[in-house]
């Protein structure tokens, strides 16, 4: 974990949130694991930050993620007329300045520090399950989902037919 | 134009089945699941579940789950929900519903069908 | 399942009034409410979602607000078209669930 108070980074002004002018619709400091309860976590190693799908030991503090909720057009939005066709983005940040960003080409998912307006692999189309868990779309990707590869997050093209509530693309979000 | 259009009003007996449907327009079909919702006579609201155009998938709220069966037609962009074993306890208002956000159900219920009322009676 | 309290059950006012109503939730929904008018014989319409958020063509003078477990919508200036009944909808969590609804009439 990062060894810093997640809350106390987090008291700034709604973290400092705009793009391109717009404010998120709500924030919301929680902590991420998997459909099978594992633990997403982010360490620093080598100048750069790294991230685990683990089972933390009993007691174990938890990472905590911010979520920044945006509202966007969607883009098969067929009556033009901007009432229809909006969808929810999320962006993810574990500490101040660093992002989930994904990276298509590689199919992985990595921590970036950058600046705003963020990139638009910053964003991810925010689903939620019946199992009252999320899932996170690639806006730069459609169908391809933030999943759970090898205790790693990665990648995973959910094929449009299928149940999107494949557990390895299934996550919990929880304040404690 | 989003259009969601239910079938019309349907008088059944008891321990009777109906089936009655919602059609849907001006949107892409399988990008929003199907909601129904129930409201008897000068009551509230309550969700009996939906179904995901693309994969036929359903959620059942559980007080509904051995009332209502939804499935879908997605050549025609309609869904069916059948209710079964009806009693007088089943005589309302059932309208379908289409979410605000494209995945998501936070944004509440923006489209509406003009509901579909089913009278139980001997 | 998560409760959603919606308190007064019916309200009595004048045209011109500013009236409130109140949406408790049985447990955290950050800010996925949403509140709906629903006239008599009609279905209901979408006023307010994420709590404070105008629908497309809603009059500014509905206002919706809160965040957590208390949420209140507002209706200032009342207007004749306003009387109908008024419900507020949870959206973070499954079985979606409604308040019992508010009925507002003239005084």
């Known amino acids: 974990a990062f060894g810093i108070s997640g809350v106390q980074k987090y008291t700034r002004a709604l973290h400092d949130s705009s793009i391109t002018g717009i404010s998120p619709i709500t924030e919301y400091l929680a902590s991420l694991s998997t459909y099978n309860d594992q633990s997403i976590t982010f360490a620093l190693e080598d100048e750069s930050y790294e991230i685990y799908v683990e089972d933390l030991k009993k007691d174990e503090k938890k990472d905590k993620v911010l979520l920044s909720y945006y509202e966007s057009q969607h883009p098969s939005n067929e009556s033009g007329d901007g009432v229809d066709g909006k969808m929810l983005m999320v962006t993810l940040s574990p500490t101040k300045d660093f992002w989930l960003h994904a990276n298509n080409k590689e199919h992985s998912v990595e921590l970036h520090k950058c600046e705003k307006p963020l990139p638009d692999q910053a964003f991810f189309v925010l689903h939620n399950m019946h199992s009252n868990c999320v899932s996170f779309e690639c806006k730069t990707d459609p169908g391809v989902f933030i999943g759970v590869k090898d205790n790693h997050l990665a990648l995973i093209k959910v094929d449009s037919s299928e149940n999107l509530c494949t557990e390895n693309i299934l996550f919990k979000l929880s304040e404690t | 134009e989003v259009l969601l259009q239910q079938s019309g009003p349907e008088l059944v007996k008891p321990g009777a089945s109906v089936k009655i449907s919602c059609n849907a327009s001006?949107?892409?079909?399988?990008?929003?699941?199907m909601n129904w919702v129930k409201q008897s006579h000068g009551k509230s609201l309550e969700s009996i579940g939906d179904i995901n155009p693309k994969n036929g998938d359903t959620f059942y709220n559980q007080n509904f789950k051995d009332k209502a069966t939804l499935t879908i037609d997605k050549s025609s962009s309609t869904v069916y929900m059948e209710l079964r074993s009806l009693t007088s306890e089943d005589t309302a208002m059932y309208y379908c519903a289409r979410h605000y956000y494209y995945g998501s159900s936070y944004g509440g219920f923006v489209y509406w069908g003009q509901g579909t009322l089913v009278t139980v009676a001997a | 399942d998560i409760q959603m309290n919606q308190s007064p059950s019916s309200l009595s006012a004048s045209l011109g009034d500013t009236i409130t109503i109140t949406c408790h939730a049985s447990?955290?929904?950050?800010?996925?409410l949403s509140w709906y008018q629903q006239k008599a014989g009609n279905n209901p319409k979408l006023l307010i979602y994420a709590a404070s958020k105008l629908h497309t063509g809603v009059p500014s003078r509905f206002t919706g607000s809160g965040s957590g477990t208390l949420f209140t919508l507002t209706i200032s200036s009342l207007q004749p078209e306003d009387i109908a009944t008024y419900y507020c909808?949870?959206?973070?969590?499954?079985?979606?669930?409604f308040g019992s609804g508010t009925n507002l009439e003239l005084k």
């Open positions: 909808q949870q959206g973070q969590s499954y079985p979606l669930t």
């Open positions: 447990q955290n929904i950050n800010v996925w």
């Open positions: 001006g949107y892409t079909f399988s990008d929003y699941n």
